[in-house]
Interface confidence: low
């Protein structure tokens, strides 16, 4: 599956590590 980090209103960022993490905090991840 390809996973994406959701940022802002419409940007999608592919997450290669399979997590969306900033400074140890996890954020919304969408995998499809």
């Amino acid at each position: 599956a390809t996973c994406y980090c959701r940022t802002g209103r419409c940007a999608t960022r592919e997450s290669l590590s399979g997590v969306c993490e900033i400074s140890g905090r996890l954020y919304r991840l969408c995998c499809r």
Epitope: T2, C5, G8, R9, A11, R13, L16, S17, C20, I22
Partner: antibody, heavy 119, light 111 residues
């Protein structure tokens, strides 16, 4: 150490196509994205798009859709950008840059490739 | 697209003094309590170099003379004290929304 080595300067005719390369070393190529950025002489920076070498997935700035095509070869750790239907507006320095994972900024840059489009 | 407006376009500062560069976004670049604004330094004939990421985080190897602050739409890069090696053009860049965009640049010179 992380390095992005770009191909040499190019001179191309209007209407032609050109393929620029960016060879990565010093890190796992498939663990980061690669973006391409355009800079016209004496001007600012424009994000063209990015490719994730592991999946081959690409994301483009709408402005450059149909102009730029991004590809990557995992076996040689090299990213490519093909520019088509060249005009004088495409004359610029093109940089490749490594994308930080997930919430990206550009943490390492190639030295740039100068493209001159002239008849 | 999010438009980033930098000011001033050029700046002359005496050695040892403080340089302040502003970047204003046409809409908020904040998400999840973080600001997705970054700063780069570019010297003639060289690629840009990352200085500050997510508004206020100093990139590894960058001197502590460089600092960043701000949130939502208003951001500042401060260099204090300015050294001769800081002569360059400075760009802000947002990654909160596609397409990623850059400011027009601020050229720093020594007075």
């Amino acid at each position: 150490q992380v390095q992005l080595q770009q191909s040499g300067a190019e001179l191309a005719r209007p209407g032609a196509s050109v393929k620029l390369s960016c060879k990565a070393s010093g890190y796992t190529f498939t663990s980061y994205g690669i973006s391409w950025v355009k800079q016209r002489t004496g001007q600012g920076l424009e994000w063209i798009g990015e490719i994730y070498p592991r999946s081959g997935n690409t994301y483009y700035n709408e402005k450059f859709k149909g102009k730029a095509t991004l590809t990557a070869d995992k076996s040689s750790s090299t990213a490519y950008m093909q520019l088509s239907s060249l005009t004088s507006e495409d004359s610029a320095v093109y940089f490749c840059a490594r994308d930080y994972d997930g919430f990206p900024y550009f943490d390492y840059w190639g030295q740039g490739t100068t493209l001159t489009v002239s008849s | 697209d999010i438009v980033l407006t930098q000011s001033p376009a050029s700046l002359a500062v005496s050695l040892g003094q403080r340089a302040t560069i502003s970047c204003r976004a046409s809409e908020s670049v904040d998400s999840y309590g973080y600001s997705f604004m970054h700063w780069y330094q570019q010297k003639p004939g060289q690629p840009p170099k990352l200085l500050i990421y997510r508004a206020s985080n100093l990139e590894s190897g960058i001197p502590a003379r460089f600092s960043g602050s701000g949130s939502r739409t208003d951001f500042t890069l401060t260099i204090n004290p300015v050294e001769a090696d800081d002569v360059a053009t400075y760009y802000c860049q947002q990654s909160n929304e596609d397409p990623r965009t850059f400011g027009g640049g601020t050229k720093l010179e020594i007075k």
